[in-house]
């Protein structure tokens, strides 16, 4: 029930989760200098029942040097088998999170984890794409893939998301241009390191637009 | 508890505006797209458009295109839609509804959500009449 | 804009029964289908989301399958409150669109 593969890779794009289905298994990762605790567990696991799903296990790191210091981070990538990336950022609000039913949330940080979460993901899981900052997304279809399973294998979808600068034209037919960056504000900084899974409604081609007017607006 | 909470009934006559709003509550605000969509007496759901409240990007049904305006407050969670030029045709319970997204940048120029319209708001009677 | 036909307008059942819903949506939508519940005088309920999920706190005997164009909702045994009308919703292609509603009633 595992996914052979990763996520297919989008040029100028990023993917991410927004929840995990049962049977999803995250690695325990810590960042250079700190390793999995010996007692702890390689990964934590997406289990739920008919209600409720949690992660089963705590990843937990301890310094390299100091043995004894024990640290409630990320296990250590060298253990790692297939490394599954998410391509996300540890650091993401949980309150903006949805609770799915069969579904984990992503997990909170745990101190000095790997920068990167290596996921494991099981068929049926969805990730969902965003073009990276700098550039736009051609509206052509969902802009996320679905791990299914065809014919005995596992594949994913591919998603219909095409990103281009932003001095390239990249409108529906009859949307404007803004102006200027909304509310006059600086693009996120932490928006270039995450990836957040924007789930738009997609268009799978321009032409079904015709009598559809986009209108991007900033008060 | 998470909830969306809507302005009460309106009369109005033809050619006259009328502002609906929709106060959200119990959960992260930027992190919802909110769908306004009006259900006209015995007939079915009609969507008129979507606002990211995270810049108040929006976008338009073509039908109600020039007519409607959505804007949002942050600082109120409230968002609201203003309809102009009515005539008796827009008698309708008007809702807003909440969608997840993910683009939450102001510079964001995506405008992806999925899950469902999983919270509405009570609905908001506008009647226009002569 | 993707038109999407739900069938039959009105279904007549007694509890107990399966209801079978049908929405049939003019071009593809992959499994981009919700389905919604609204009963008189209420807002609609989401029920089903990506064609066969449930929604948080959703009972079992709603279910839901299709992918493409042809779209299904089954409640496999009707209980008094189930008796409402539902709406199928499409989010693959801007704009939104919804059907014209089934009502199941009471027969």
């Known amino acids: 029930e595992l996914c052979d593969d990763d996520p297919p890779k989008i040029t100028h794009a990023t993917f991410k989760a927004v929840a995990y289905k049962e049977g999803t298994m995250l690695n325990c990762e810590c960042k250079r200098g700190f390793r999995r605790i010996k007692s702890g567990s390689p990964y934590m696991l997406c289990t739920g029942n008919s209600s409720h799903s949690s992660w089963d296990n705590q990843c937990q790191c301890t310094s390299s040097a100091a043995r004894n210091t024990t640290k409630q981070v990320t296990p250590q990538p060298e253990e790692q088998k297939e490394r599954k990336t998410t391509e996300m950022q540890s650091q993401m609000q949980l309150a903006d999170q949805v609770s799915l039913p069969g579904h984990c949330r992503e997990p909170p940080p745990w101190e000095n984890e790997a920068t990167e979460r290596i996921y494991h993901f099981v068929v049926g899981q969805t990730v969902y794409y965003q073009c990276v900052q700098g550039y736009r997304a051609l509206h052509r279809g969902p802009a996320e893939s679905v791990c299914k399973m065809t014919h005995g294998k596992t594949r994913w979808t591919q998603p219909q998301l095409i990103c281009t600068g932003e001095t390239e034209p990249s409108q529906f037919p009859g949307e404007e241009e803004p102006q200027a960056s909304p509310d006059g504000l600086p693009e996120s900084e932490t928006s270039r390191l995450v990836t957040t899974t924007d789930f738009r409604i997609q268009t799978e081609v321009a032409a079904t637009m015709e009598t559809f007017i986009f209108t991007t607006e900033y008060q | 508890q998470v909830q969306l909470v809507q302005s009460g009934a309106e009369v109005k006559k033809p050619g006259a505006s009328v502002k609906v709003s929709c106060k959200a509550s119990g959960y992260t605000f930027n992190s919802y797209y909110i769908h306004w969509v009006r259900q006209a007496p015995g007939q079915g759901l009609e969507w008129l458009g979507i606002i990211n409240p995270t810049g108040g990007r929006t976008i338009y049904a073509q039908k109600f295109q020039g007519r409607v305006t959505m804007t949002r407050d942050t600082s109120t969670t409230t968002v609201d839609m203003e309809l102009s030029s009515l005539r008796s045709e827009d008698t309708a319970v008007y809702y807003c509804?909440?969608?997840?997204?993910?683009?939450?940048?102001?510079?964001?120029?995506?405008?992806?959500?999925?899950?469902?319209?999983?919270?509405w708001g009570q609905g908001s009677t506008v009647t226009v009449s002569s | 804009e993707i038109v999407l036909t739900q069938s039959p307008a009105t279904l007549s059942l007694s509890p107990g029964e399966r209801a079978t819903l049908s929405c049939r949506a003019s071009q593809s939508v992959s499994s981009y289908l919700a389905w919604y519940q609204q009963k008189p005088g209420q807002a609609p309920r989401l029920l089903i989301y990506d064609a066969s999920n449930r929604a948080t706190g959703i009972p079992a005997r709603f279910s839901g399958s299709g992918s493409g164009t042809d779209f299904t909702l089954t409640i496999s045994s009707l209980e008094p409150e189930d008796f409402a009308v539902y709406y199928c919703q499409q989010r693959s292609n801007w704009p939104p669109t919804f059907g014209q509603g089934t009502k199941v009633e009471i027969k």
């Open positions: 509804a909440r969608v997840p997204g993910y683009c939450k940048d102001t510079s964001c120029q995506d405008f992806y959500y999925y899950y469902g319209m999983d919270v």
